[in-house]
Amino acid sequence: EEELQVIQPEKSVSVAAGDSATLNCTVSSLIPVGPIQWFRGAGPGRELIYNLKEGHFPRVTPVSDPTKRNNMDFSIRISNITPADAGTYYCVKFRKGSPDVELKSGAGTELSVRAKPS
């Protein structure tokens, strides 16, 4: 069987402060069963950026309709970007469990923030 792939096509994205950033992510299969989460940074200190099920992420919205059937596009849009948002963002697939188990991460997309043009 083909192994699940988590595809982040852009290695880097540059956005002007105050604009929105789109971070793209697709997966190659609906299975194994389990959620996708977005993080900034890697390792134990990484910051959770978006999880549709839990938490409150007012500046983050999924690009595709969250109610879309059999959706394999897990891209997100972050609004009102500030310099503090700079970093590398990872789209991560988890296997359903108690707790969920990290299965595979995308290669990451580095977000850089340009000064807002005057």
Epitope: E1, L4, I31, K53, P62, P66, T67, R69
Partner: antibody, heavy 120, light 108 residues
Amino acid sequence: EVQLLESGGGVVQPGGSLRLSCAASGFSFSNFAMTWVRQAPGEGLEWVSTIGSGDTYYADSVKGRFTISRDNSKNTLYLQMNSLRAEDTAVYYCAKDSTVSWSGDFFDYWGLGTLVTVSS
Amino acid sequence: EIVLTQSPATLSVSPGERATFSCRASQNVKNDLAWYQQRPGQAPRLLIYAARIRETGIPERFSGSGSGTEFTLTITSLQSEDFAVYYCQQYYDWPPFTFGGGTKVEIK
């Protein structure tokens, strides 16, 4: 057209075993999680087990006794049922999972079911 | 485990009338709720998912509403083929997937 056809039901004594099969057609079987749901006579629906690719999930009532598996080359889902009890008597439905909200599953196609009767 | 409670257990309605019944979750399931119809001797059939989205081919007289812990399925102008048992199912937190106990819609 999606079709799911269960087979393998029958009458078995308590403590016995049965293997149910579900032949699937009309969709890309290997791309979807699959589920068994049962319905005791005159009762409601009870989730039994779900399989993704290598990942399997079971209701507490069947854990350790039932094993779900799939053969993607044959487009077939299986449920091996061991140590059967009277309370396992039910119609067993095979269902295709559909995913929404990034991680949740519901069941968009169902087979007609196969009856399992556990009785001495 | 999330418990789903459906009410009423039985609803007696005349053909052409409106039927409304509810599904209450023991904890927040957001919009992760589906509704199924089961006619006598048949397999369940998906009607609604994501609390309010009609499955392809389901007549417009079926509508779902609600979020969180309170959900409603409404059938406007009941047809003869609508007399059946209706189940809700949550998929927010699993395993286990859980179903409500069902509401039987019978002819008055």
